[in-house]
C-alpha cells in the first residue's frame, strides 16, 4: 500500500514536472523525455488505478448532443439548407482531415489552432480547420472554374473555447460558396442576402452585417505608414475593436507589435468610423485613402454593392465598419461579419453586438495556390455559425420552457384489451409501409393508461386502438391526444385520415 | 535478490582509456534507467552519466561529456562506461546504480564499486 | 547546477539520542530530494525518496520532511548501526548533484 501512495505520490510529481517543462518552453528532447518517464510511472500504477481515476468525459471543447438539442440543431438545419437551395446550390463532401500541406500557410496567425494528427505512417495529415480550404483544393484538383455549392460539416480548431458562449474545438460550419468569373459584385450581393434571410429565418433576435473590404483596409494601412510586413498582423489588432476599446487596440498595436504611436493614430482615425453608403462616398473623396489604387478599387465596389445590397432590400442591415479586419490570411475583397444586437437599455444608445453568428468574404487567391499554373479562380462565401446559433436557441426556447419534440412519430398504435399483441403488430407495419411515422409499446398487454401517457410525454399527437369489439366492425379508434376526442375510423380509410390530420401528403413522393 | 556487479577498473596513466561493465541480476534489467556514480577517495558522491531504458536517452557532467560513452545491452543484461583521455581527477570508485521505479533519478540499488586509479 | 549544501558537515551523539541533519538547496527542488546512509568501504544505501518517503527495508526511526529548499533528515531514537556519513541529492533536474555529506559519530 505504502508503495502505491509512493507511486502515486511520484505520477504527481512528474506531471507537474512535465507541466513546469513545458511552461518553461524546455527543450523538446527534454519534455519527451520526461512525459516518456511520467507514462512509465504511471504504467507501473497498474490498470485499476487508471480505471479508478479516469473520468467519463467528452474531451475538451466538445459536447454530446441530446435528442431535444438535436431536435433544435436540425430545425436550424433544415432552415439554411432550405435557403441555401432556394438560391441554386449543389452540395458536396469532403475528408474530415486533408494533408498537412494543403492548410499549411492558409490561416496565418490562426495556423497554431490547426490539429495535427498522429504519423499513420507516412503522410502528414491535419483536422480541417474550416470548409473553405478543403472547397479551394477541390476545385483546383478538379479543375473546376464554375460552382455554387453549401457543404455542412464539423470543423477542429485547436481554441481555449468559452463553451458557454457557443465555442467548441468541434463544431459544424454551414457555408455557402460561389466559384467563377463574374461581374463584380452581383455574387457578394447575393451572399449578403443569404446571410440576411438565414438570420431572419431564425429569428433569433435583431442583427447587423459589418461590410469592409480588404483592399481598403491594405490601402489605408499602406497611406498610414504601416510596412508591408505588419499588414497581417495589425489587421488582428484592429478586428478586436468589436470587443476591446481604441486604447487597447493601440497600446497592443504600439507596444507588442512594435508600431509608430502617429502610425496607430492615422489607423485610429479611420478605423473607429462606419455607416452605409455615404461613409463610402466620403472616403471616396478622402484626399490620401483616393489616391491609392486598391484603396480606390475596393470602396469602387463597395459603392456597387450597396446598390445592389439596396435592391435586394437589405441595405438597412448592412454597416460600412472599418474595423472588420477578419482573421483569415486567405480574403482579398469584400469581407463581412453578422452580429447580433443585444437591445439598447435606452433609446438612442448605440446597439451592441453579441458576437459573430455568421462571415465570410471574397477570397481570389486561394484556388490559385494548389494549381501548379497558379491559376485563380474567384470565390466568394459566407459561413453560418451554427453553434452559436443552436445555444441562443435553446436559450430562448428554455426561457419560453417551449416542449421541444424529439421524435416524429404521428401515431401510436394500442390496444384496449390484452391478447392483441399480434393485431397491434400488423396494424402497426401497415402504417410503416404507408408512410406513416408510427410506434407501439414494446410490452404483450400494456395498460391503456400507459400507452395514452406515453403519448403525452413524446408529443404524439394520435392513439390508434384497437378493440375486440372494433376487429369485429373491421374499424378503428382513433383518438386525438390533446382533445381527447374519438372518431371510429374504417380500417382501409385509417392511413388517408392519419395524413389528413397530421398534414402530410396523401403520396409517399 | 537485485544485485549489481561492477568490474574493469585498475591502474591507468593520464590520457588512457578503460572500460567498465555491469552485470544486472534480480530485476527487469530492461525496463530501467541506469546510471553510473563515482567517488573521489575521502571525497562526495558525483553522478556521472546515466541511460535510458532502451538506450534513447543518455547524459554527461560537464567533467566527463565528450571522454566518456555510457551504453548497455538489454540482451546480455549489461552496462557500459567507455573511459578515454583520463584524467588524475578521474580517480574514483565507480558505481553502477539502478534508478528507483525504473524512471526516477535516486539510486535504489548499487553494486559494489570498481576503482579507478589514473596516475603515471 | 543545483547546488546541494548540508549541516552540519559532523555530529557527534549518543545512542538514543534524536538528530536532525538539513540539507538546502540552490533553488526549489520541489520534493524531489532523497537521503542515503554510507558506511566506510560500502556503497550508499537509499533511506528516503521524495523528501518524506521511507524505502522499503528502512527501519521507521527515520524520518524526512521538507520541500523546495529546505528539507531534513531525522533519525529519532540512534542505534549503533545508525553512526555512518549521510548524503542528500538532489533529483530535480540533471546534473544531480549531492550535499557534501555529514558524519555521524559517537560522542
Known amino acids: 500500500m505504502a508503495e502505491r501512495a509512493a507511486l502515486e505520490e511520484l505520477v504527481k510529481l512528474q506531471g507537474e514536472r512535465v507541466r513546469g517543462l513545458k511552461q518553461q518552453k524546455a527543450s523538446a528532447e527534454l519534455i519527451e523525455e520526461e512525459v516518456a518517464k511520467l507514462l512509465k510511472l504511471k504504467a507501473q500504477l497498474g490498470p485499476d488505478e487508471s480505471k479508478q481515476k479516469f473520468v467519463l468525459k467528452t474531451p475538451k471543447g466538445t459536447r454530446d448532443y441530446s435528442p431535444r438539442q438535436m431536435a433544435v440543431r436540425e430545425k436550424v438545419f433544415d432552415v439554411i439548407i432550405r435557403c441555401f437551395k432556394r438560391h441554386g446550390a449543389e452540395v458536396i463532401d469532403t475528408p474530415v482531415f486533408e494533408l498537412k500541406e494543403t492548410l499549411m500557410g492558409k490561416y496565418g496567425e490562426d495556423s497554431k489552432l490547426i490539429y495535427d494528427l498522429k504519423d499513420q505512417g507516412g503522410e502528414l495529415l491535419s483536422l480541417r480547420y474550416d470548409l473553405t480550404v478543403p472547397f479551394a483544393r477541390y476545385l483546383a484538383m478538379n479543375k473546376l472554374t464554375n460552382i455554387k455549392r453549401y457543404h455542412i460539416a464539423k470543423v477542429y480548431r485547436r481554441d481555449n473555447p468559452a463553451m458557454t458562449r457557443g465555442r467548441y474545438r468541434e463544431f459544424y460550419q454551414c457555408d455557402f460558396d460561389i466559384a467563377g468569373n463574374f461581374d463584380p459584385m452581383i455574387p457578394d450581393a447575393e451572399c449578403l442576402k443569404i446571410m440576411c434571410e438565414i438570420l431572419s429565418s431564425l429569428q433569433i433576435g435583431d442583427f447587423l452585417v459589418k461590410v469592409n473590404d480588404r483592399r481598403i483596409l491594405d490601402g489605408m494601412f499602406a497611406i498610414c505608414g504601416v510596412s508591408d510586413s505588419k499588414f497581417r498582423t495589425i489587421c488582428s489588432s484592429v478586428d478586436k475593436l468589436d470587443k476591446v476599446s481604441w486604447e487597447e487596440v493601440k497600446n497592443e498595436m504600439v507596444g507588442e507589435k512594435g508600431l509608430a504611436p502617429e502610425v496607430a493614430d492615422r489607423i485610429g482615425d479611420y478605423v473607429q468610423q462606419h455607416g452605409g453608403v455615404s461613409l463610402v462616398e466620403q472616403l471616396l473623396q478622402d484626399p490620401k485613402l483616393s489616391q491609392n489604387k486598391q484603396a480606390l478599387e475596393g470602396l469602387g465596389d463597395l459603392k456597387l454593392l450597396f446598390e445592389y445590397l439596396t435592391l435586394f432590400g437589405i441595405d438597412d442591415k448592412i454597416s460600412f465598419d472599418l474595423s472588420l479586419a477578419r482573421g483569415l490570411d486567405y480574403y482579398t475583397g469584400v469581407i463581412y461579419e453578422a452580429v447580433l444586437l443585444q437591445t439598447p437599455a435606452q433609446a438612442g444608445e448605440e446597439p451592441l453586438g453579441v458576437g459573430s453568428v455568421a462571415a465570410g468574404g471574397r477570397y481570389d487567391g486561394l484556388v490559385g495556390m494548389f494549381d501548379p499554373k497558379g491559376r485563380k479562380v474567384p470565390c466568394v462565401g459566407l459561413s453560418i455559425g451554427v453553434e452559436r446559433i443552436f445555444s441562443i436557441v435553446e436559450q430562448r426556447l428554455e426561457a419560453l420552457e417551449e416542449k421541444i419534440r424529439t421524435t416524429e412519430t404521428q401515431v401510436l398504435v394500442a390496444s384496449a384489451q390484452k391478447k392483441l399483441l399480434e393485431e397491434r403488430l400488423k396494424l402497426v407495419s401497415e402504417l410503416w409501409d404507408a408512410g406513416i411515422k408510427a410506434e407501439l409499446l414494446y410490452k404483450k398487454n400494456p395498460k391503456l393508461l400507459n400507452q395514452l401517457q406515453y403519448c403525452e410525454e413524446a408529443g404524439i399527437p394520435l392513439v390508434a386502438i384497437i378493440g375486440e369489439q372494433e376487429l369485429k366492425d373491421g374499424v378503428i379508434k382513433l383518438r386525438s391526444v390533446t382533445s381527447r376526442e374519438e372518431v371510429d375510423v374504417r380500417r382501409e380509410d385509417l392511413v388517408e385520415e392519419i395524413k389528413r390530420r397530421t398534414g402530410q401528403p396523401l403520396c409517399i413522393c | 535478490q537485485v544485485q549489481l556487479v561492477e568490474s574493469g577498473g585498475g591502474l591507468v596513466k593520464p590520457g588512457g582509456s578503460l572500460r567498465l561493465s555491469c552485470a544486472a541480476s534480480?530485476?527487469?534489467?530492461?525496463?530501467?534507467?541506469m546510471s553510473w556514480i563515482r567517488q573521489a577517495p575521502g571525497k562526495g558522491l558525483e553522478w556521472v552519466s546515466y541511460i535510458s531504458d532502451k538506450s534513447r536517452y543518455t547524459k554527461y557532467t560537464d567533467k566527463v561529456r565528450g571522454r566518456f560513452t555510457i551504453s548497455r545491452d538489454n540482451a546480455k543484461n549489461s552496462l557500459y562506461l567507455q573511459m578515454n583521455s583520463l584524467r588524475a581527477e578521474d580517480t574514483a570508485v565507480y558505481y553502477c546504480?539502478?534508478?528507483?521505479?525504473?524512471?526516477?533519478?535516486?539510486?535504489?540499488?548499487w553494486g559494489q564499486g570498481t576503482l579507478v586509479t589514473v596516475s603515471s | 547546477d543545483i547546488q546541494m549544501t548540508q549541516s552540519p558537515s559532523s555530529v557527534s551523539a549518543s545512542v538514543g539520542d534524536r538528530v536532525t541533519i538539513t540539507c538546502r538547496a540552490s533553488q526549489g527542488i520541489s520534493s524531489w530530494l532523497a537521503w542515503f546512509q554510507q558506511k566506510p568501504g560500502k556503497a550508499p544505501k537509499l533511506l528516503i525518496f521524495v523528501a518524506s518517503n521511507l524505502e522499503s527495508g528502512v527501519p521507521s526511526r527515520f524520518s524526512g520532511s521538507g520541500s523546495g529548499t529546505d528539507f531534513t533528515l531525522t533519525i529519532s531514537s540512534l542505534q549503533p548501526e545508525d553512526f555512518a556519513t549521510y548524503y542528500c541529492q538532489q533529483a530535480e533536474s540533471f546534473p544531480y548533484t549531492f550535499g557534501q555529506g555529514t558524519k555521524l559519530e559517537i560522542k
Open positions: 546504480a539502478r534508478y528507483l521505479y525504473q524512471v526516477i533519478a535516486i539510486a535504489d540499488a
Open positions: 534480480g530485476f527487469t534489467f530492461s525496463d530501467y534507467y
